[in-house]
């Protein structure tokens, strides 16, 4: 299971408890909160990570303008219900029987309701726009160097197939990373763009989910890339359903 045998740890998820209690003393790691065994050779699903966290945050425009249907995660942390595969259940409820529907990255996509609320399916987030602002530097980064470094990061650190990094846009000091992954494109074993984006978000915040690795040290041609603001927009395969009251607020 690629949990480090010698000291029995999970390189890709520090929110686990690992024990040499598998057959023959094999190391096996379980996610905090859910108790589900995790595959330490790849990223753990965002739902299991959130559950674990709750048991133990102009001219010549080339930047993407998020669509009117783009969602931002304004609700913050909650203790999610995960399905047997570790994915978010379509309907989430809190202890006071307030319920809402979420997308595949766990972001609310409907108004809140009561226990009678129905969420027929888990709607897939197929397009994620990561909007970063970097700290001032002597000069702008070279766009192609920046593009190459961010693609390398998602490929090597987050194990995301390069075809899912659709584009990297740069207009100093704003960087935008576009991740796209349709249901039909995602093969068995592929890292989900939602999971990769969540690991990246936590890295950027200095809250790395990787075991024992130093924090994220992003450099472009040796120059540190320090992020001072992050916004993530989520676009679903089916537009969200909010009341007009919210849309005009």
């Amino acid at each position: 299971h690629t949990a480090a045998q010698d000291n029995c740890t999970c390189p890709t998820n520090k929110m686990t408890v690992c024990s040499p209690d598998g057959p023959g003393g094999r190391c096996q790691c379980r996610a905090l909160g859910s108790g589900m065994a995790v595959d330490c050779s790849t990223l753990t699903s965002k739902c299991l990570l959130l559950k674990a966290r709750m048991s133990a945050p102009k001219n010549a425009r080339t930047l993407v303008r998020p669509s009117e249907h783009a969602l931002v995660d304004n609700d913050g942390l909650y203790d999610p219900d995960c399905d047997p595969e570790g994915r978010f259940k379509a309907r989430q409820c809190n202890q006071t029987s307030v319920c809402w529907c979420v997308n595949s990255v766990g972001v609310r996509r409907t108004d809140k309701g009561d226990l009678s609320l129905r969420c027929d399916e888990l709607v897939r987030t197929h397009h994620i726009l990561i909007d970063l602002r970097h700290r001032p530097t002597a000069g702008a980064f070279n766009h192609s160097d920046l593009d190459a470094e961010l693609r390398r990061l998602f490929r090597e650190r987050y194990r995301l197939h390069p075809k899912f990094v659709a584009a990297v846009h740069y207009e100093q000091p704003t960087i935008q990373i576009e991740l796209r992954q349709n249901t039909s494109q995602k093969a068995a074993g592929d890292v989900d763009i939602g999971d990769a984006a969540y690991y990246f978000e936590r890295d950027i915040k200095g809250e790395s989910l990787f075991q024992g690795r130093g924090g994220l040290d992003l450099r472009v041609r040796g120059e540190p890339l320090q992020v001072e603001r992050t916004l993530i927009y989520y676009l679903d395969e089916i537009p969200p359903k909010f009341s007009m009251k919210r849309l005009t607020a």
Epitope: V17, S19, G22, S34, A37, P84, G86
Partner: antibody, heavy 115, light 113 residues
């Protein structure tokens, strides 16, 4: 070899509480989960919860939240379970077990709640 | 919670026979990440604590006679006892450790003629 030695039988009054122990030997206590299981005649086996002494991580079956409290003392390699507000429904054999493969079980502690 | 259903609840066999015990689960116990089935079989003899026989659905514990075999995947699992012996008189339980809370089946009581 691995052993889990549980404390002796208990006869207690309804409404009181009891604390039973499970002393581990023969392995590194802090590296394995210890689970607790209830067995009543005609009710089979019920998983109460578990504790990881190496980090004091604890999980409870919802049915036993507020009823059972799990703790561990790493110095004496002993796990404890306290049961409170006892009723006749709590009369049972309680087992501690090292979870995972090669699961080792204690011999059980018989709890009788009677007035 | 995952519900574990065992059948039959009891059976009586003659020594030397082959026995098949069933355990069905309300959801799959096959973890898509680790590709293991998180199902355990226990044997409990009268007056004793349960003893682990099979882990991860099919891995026999050290010291368990090879006449005990675990099989199955997903939601349907089987414990097969070949050439049943008098000392196999016991209650057999399945348990999952897929996710919390771990739950047990209600058991199958094996009696020998």
């Amino acid at each position: 070899q691995v052993q889990l030695q549980q404390s002796g039988p208990e006869l207690v009054r309804p409404g009181t509480s009891v604390k039973m122990s499970c002393k581990a030997a023969g392995y590194t206590f802090t590296k394995f989960w210890i689970g607790w299981v209830k067995q009543r005649p005609g009710h089979g086996l019920e998983w109460i919860g578990n504790i990881y002494p190496g980090g004091a991580y604890i999980n409870y079956n919802e049915n036993f939240k507020g009823k059972a409290t799990l703790t561990a003392d790493t110095f004496s390699s002993t796990a404890y379970m306290q049961l409170n507000s006892l009723t006749s429904a709590d009369s049972a054999i309680y087992y501690c077990a090292r979870e995972g493969s090669s699961g080792y079980w204690g011999q059980g502690t018989t709890l009788t709640v009677s007035s | 919670d995952i519900v574990m259903t065992q059948s039959p609840s009891s059976l009586t066999v003659t020594a030397g026979e082959k026995v098949t015990l069933s355990c069905k689960c309300s959801q799959s116990l096959l973890n898509s990440g680790t590709q293991e089935n998180y199902l355990t079989w226990y044997q409990q003899k009268p007056g004793q604590p349960p003893k682990m026989l099979i882990y991860w659905a099919s891995i026999r514990e050290p010291g368990v006679p090879d006449r005990f075999t675990g099989s199955g995947s997903g939601t349907d699992f089987t414990l097969t006892i070949n050439n049943v012996q008098a000392e196999d008189l016991a209650v057999y339980y399945c348990q999952h450790d897929y996710s919390y809370p771990f739950t047990f089946g209600s058991g199958t009581k094996l009696e020998i003629k």
